[in-house]
């Protein structure tokens, strides 16, 4: 058997660090057997069999000029093997961050904090942490570790499915190369990393007869669980075209009637979502949708609310169907004082 331990990486390659002493090992001889060493393609003897170093070649303070292929020969001139030297650095702790788009799963991504120049792989696992004692704030790793399954095709990402919203997890991402391993531990709780995807299917419609009104509606993001234990709350922003500043409201549900739109101007509208108990952070904004308040004449009779909100003849396509859910929308109020003022303003 070879006297050379096989480092992780391709066969026949041995590794060292620039500026450090490097030992190369002749793979096809018995440990301690004296050998001669040559650079591949060069006749000059690098180290003879009388060096006292047996089957090893020592390169003091290796640098990039030492990289390449070496040949070792036994005393009788037989080929002891070829070795390729590659220089690089031990791993540094990777940089890890985790995010969750819902309250049941989370993913972690990583990047090397330093490039080692060597073949590198990552080991990913997690533990669930539990509180020690009823009154204690101390936490200790208790269950696991379990593997955090990595995305195929080498994407630097792993996903934990079926996580518990109220638990804390310790993520372990270990960078491994032939010169060693280095581990980053990251404590995460779903509550703090939760960031929903933005709401989908945003549409903006005019309200016939009301030149300062727009009705915006949207659906939950498709990534939010279909039968949610946790609801989302929303934030809506709107602004007339060419106006730099957004107005912000927090709707009670999946629609909002804007009552102070600028008559005749198209308006941009966007929405964002967050866990209804304020866990985590707000989602990114949805793509903007545009709508222009109605310029039509006011009906002689004030219609009932339901008639104001007739559905368009052709239903706009939505990215994905919204899950059925309890409505958080209060019953729309009948026309209030603001409506009267608006009517007067239009009639004047």
């Amino acid at each position: 058997s070879s006297p050379c331990p096989q480092a992780w990486g391709p066969p026949g390659v041995q590794y060292g660090q620039p500026g450090r002493s490097v030992k190369l090992c002749c793979p096809g001889v018995t440990a301690g057997d004296p050998v001669s060493w040559f650079r591949d393609g060069e006749p000059k003897l690098l180290q003879g069999p009388d060096s006292g170093l047996g089957h090893e070649l020592v390169l003091a303070q290796a640098d990039s000029t030492d990289e390449g292929t070496y040949i070792c020969q036994t005393l009788d001139g037989a080929l002891g093997g070829t070795v390729t030297l590659q220089l690089g650095y031990p791993p540094a702790r990777p940089v890890v961050s985790c995010q969750a788009a819902d309250y049941e799963n989370f993913s972690c991504t990583w990047s090397p904090s330093q490039i080692s120049g060597l073949p590198t792989r990552y080991l990913t696992s997690y533990r669930k942490k539990t509180v020690l004692g009823a009154d204690s704030q101390r936490r200790s790793p208790s269950t696991g570790p379990w593997p955090c399954p990595q995305d195929p095709l080498g994407a630097a990402r792993c996903v934990v499915h079926g996580a518990e919203f109220w638990s804390q997890y310790r993520i372990n991402v270990t960078e491994v190369n032939p010169l060693g391993a280095s581990t980053r531990l990251l404590d995460v709780s779903l509550q703090s990393i939760l960031r929903p995807d933005p709401p989908q299917g945003l549409r903006v419609e005019s309200v016939p007869g009301y030149p300062r009104r727009l009705r915006a509606s949207w659906t939950y993001p498709a990534s939010w669980p279909c039968q949610p234990h946790f609801l989302l709350k929303f934030r809506l922003q709107y602004r007339p075209a060419q106006h730099p500043a957004w107005s912000t409201v927090e709707p009670a549900g999946l629609e909002e009637v804007i009552t102070d739109a600028v008559a005749g101007l198209p308006h941009a509208v966007r929405v964002s979502a967050r866990d209804f108990l304020d866990a985590g952070t707000w989602s990114t904004w949805s793509p903007e949708a545009w709508g222009t308040p109605s310029t039509g004449t006011i009906p002689k009779e004030i219609p009932a609310w339901g008639q104001l909100h007739t559905q368009p003849e052709v239903e706009p396509q939505v990215d994905s169907p919204a899950p059925p859910r309890p409505s958080l929308q209060p019953h729309p109020r009948l026309l209030d004082h603001r409506d009267s003022v608006e009517q007067v303003a239009v009639l004047a």
Epitope: P112, Q114, I115
Partner: antibody
Framework: EVQLLESGGGLVQPGGSLRLSCAAS????????MTWVRQAPGKGLEWVSS????????QYADSVKGRFTISRDNSKNTLYLQMNSLRAEDTAVYYC???????????WGRGTLVTVSS | DIQMTQSPSSLSASVGDRVTITCQAS??????LNWYQQKPGKAPKLLIY???NLQTGVPSRFSGSGSGTDFTFTISSLQPEDIATYYC?????????FGPGTKVDIK
């Protein structure tokens, strides 16, 4: 020679913007994370932001989150810090630093002074 | 964020004296602690990394020890050129933090 050289500092009004640059030489810039650290006049050191070699992960101090953006151009061996919505408390000498293992700063630039004042 | 405290905030000692500075972290940072020296108008310089390792080229009179939350930095024999402010800094997590510094001068 291994060195870092910051530029882009100066006087700016509150609410204004500034872009700092850090030119690296003498080492393989694209292999290392890079960092900005600042020091207000007469005060201690404060880590501001860091970025991994690929640029794919960035990290910010809470005091600058949402206002500052760190970036890098590995083809130009240059690190950047885009500073928006500047405040008086951002007045400091800004140092560019090369860390080993993300947080061990073994190489520093000489710094560039940013003054935010009306 | 992990908070770092240093003591004393300043000290005066005679040339040849042994000088000790302590640094405490608000939570366990293993041995991910560095010590820097900063002279007026200059950039900081790394002296000790990972609690106890001497950075290349740094005189051996500087040393560090400790792990967990409590760390110590020592100058075994203070020299005139050691007049500076010394900072500890943790990098256990992804948001490094510095101690407030200890100003050292000569009596």
């Amino acid at each position: 020679e291994v060195q870092l050289l910051e530029s882009g500092g100066g006087l700016v009004q509150p609410g204004g913007s500034l872009r700092l640059s850090c030119a690296a030489s003498g080492f393989t810039f694209s292999w290392y994370s890079m960092t900005w650290v600042r020091q207000a006049p007469g005060k201690g050191l404060e880590w501001v932001s860091s970025i991994v070699p690929s640029g794919g992960h960035t990290q910010y101090a809470d005091s600058v989150k949402g206002r500052f953006t760190i970036s890098r151009d590995n083809s130009k061996n240059t690190l950047y810090l885009q500073m928006n919505s500047l405040r008086a408390e951002d007045t400091a000498v800004y140092y560019c630093a090369k860390p080993e293992d993300w947080g061990r700063f073994d190489l520093w630039g000489r710094g560039t002074l940013v003054t935010v004042s009306s | 964020d992990i908070q770092m405290t240093q003591s004393p905030s300043s000290l005066s000692a005679s040339v040849g004296d042994r000088v000790t500075i302590t640094c405490q972290a608000s939570q366990d940072i293993n041995n991910y602690l560095n010590w820097y020296q900063q002279k007026p108008g200059k950039a900081p310089k790394l002296l000790i990394y990972d609690a106890s390792n001497l950075q290349t080229g740094v005189p051996s009179r500087f040393s560090g020890s400790g792990s967990g939350t409590d760390f110590t930095f020592t100058i075994s024999s203070l020299q005139p050129e050691d007049i500076a402010t010394y900072y500890c800094q943790q990098y256990d997590n992804l948001s490094p933090t510095f101690g407030p510094g200890t100003k050292v001068d000569i009596k």
